[in-house]
Interface confidence: low
């Protein structure tokens, strides 16, 4: 499977909410011995590999924001911890998963990464990620609502397999 990032750039005004999205593409094994682990984190554009560095989102680590579930299930992060930080990550039955950030500030600007680990019990993992940029703007040049820029066809399969 692959991870697609439908949008590579989100430009939002301060105070707005935004939902960053990734999507699982390709054959996804839904057997009973397969579990998916999904999470979000901030990163920087490394020379060798984007998303190799994992930094917290609003002081929540990728461990705090993770989702784990079998192939047939939907999942949400634990509401209390994440919502206190204005965050919620979620996943549906169709391979979409997202993180919603509320009341954006300039400090939220940066590179965001989604990570998916397919765990086959008694076997090794398959790990892929996607990356997208969030720009939070203030002042007269800021848009009134979030503006999203679709990924190019090349970027939309923004994938690094382990």
């Amino acid at each position: 499977f692959k991870v697609a990032t439908p949008y590579s750039l989100y430009v939002c005004p301060e105070g707005q909410n935004v939902t960053l999205t990734c999507r699982l593409l390709g054959p996804v094994d839904k057997g009973h011995d397969v579990t998916f682990y999904k999470t979000w984190y901030r990163s920087s554009r490394g020379e060798v590999q984007t998303c190799s560095e994992r930094r917290p989102i609003r002081n929540l680590t990728f461990q705090d924001l993770h989702l784990h579930h079998g192939g047939h299930q939907a999942a949400n992060t634990s509401h209390d911890l994440a919502q206190r930080h204005g965050l919620e990550s979620a996943s549906d039955h169709h391979g979409n998963f997202s993180i919603t950030m509320r009341n954006l500030t300039l400090l939220d600007s940066g590179l965001y990464c989604c990570l998916v680990v397919e765990i086959r019990h008694h076997h090794s993992e398959h790990r892929v990620h996607g990356a997208m940029e969030l720009q939070v703007q203030t002042g007269k040049d800021a848009p009134s609502n979030c503006v999203v820029y679709p990924s190019s066809s090349q970027d939309s399969e923004n994938i690094t397999a382990a």
Epitope: Q63, H122, E125
Partner: antibody, heavy 120, light 107 residues
């Protein structure tokens, strides 16, 4: 602060079994993989296998398959490693180590180690 | 299994020296490589993950680089507390394998 505290040193006879425990505190237990890594005297590190408590299924190195059993008790946040049919070359320090997320293999927290001595 | 080969197996250096340890994988592991420091009688400590990312709390004099099969750990200015054994570890596939270690000793 995450801590992994292991059970005490053991002296065992060849052919017997040993069960080492690793109790986690200070963090979520269930969704992190716990691996077991051993180190024979003066030697390097050797991965034996691991488990994600919430999934319950362990993953073992082929070398130890059939001789090692890794389990976890979510209610006590404790992982266990049992090694059977012990031989003298199993004399080593056994470490539990927590992976930094899910079924990943970078070990960010380690137990203090448990020395298992196999001697007749 | 993926074999990990470290060199040198030991080295002598002085405080302030720049030290480089290399690790080679028997097949490509992308950037799925971690570095650990171990002192006698202690558990290993994670220094670098994903080949080049510094683990939280680790001094910036430690750095990692490489991808594919060839990797390097560099200590830019050796400090007294850095005398220890260093291990690389591939995280690409099971069984997880470690290099044989590099012992950094005082010259």
């Amino acid at each position: 602060q995450v801590q992994l505290v292991q059970s005490g040193a053991e002296v065992k006879k060849p052919g017997s079994s040993v069960k080492v425990s690793c109790k986690a505190s200070g963090g979520t237990f269930s969704s992190y993989a716990i691996s077991w890594v051993r180190q024979a005297p003066g030697q390097g590190l050797e991965w034996m296998g691991g488990i994600i408590p919430i999934f319950g299924t362990a993953n073992y190195a082929q070398k130890f398959q059939g001789r090692v059993t890794i389990t976890a008790d979510e209610s006590t946040s404790t992982a266990y490693m049992e090694l059977s049919s012990l031989r003298s070359e199993d004399t080593a320090v056994y470490y539990c180590a927590r992976s930094s997320y899910g079924w990943s293999y970078e070990f960010d927290y380690w137990g203090q180690g448990t020395l298992v001595t196999v001697s007749s | 299994d993926i074999q990990m080969t470290q060199s040198p197996s030991s080295l002598s250096a002085s405080v302030g020296d720049r030290v480089t340890i290399t690790c080679r994988a028997s097949q490509s592991i992308n950037t799925n490589l971690n570095w650990y420091q171990q002192k006698p009688g202690k558990a290993p400590k994670l220094l670098i993950y994903a080949a080049s990312s510094l683990q939280s709390g680790v001094p910036s004099r430690f750095s990692g680089s490489g991808s594919g099969t060839d990797f390097t750990l560099t200590i830019s200015s050796l400090q007294p507390e850095d005398f220890a054994t260093y291990y690389c570890q591939q995280a690409r596939d099971t069984p997880i394998t470690f290099g044989q270690g590099t012992k950094v000793e005082i010259k």
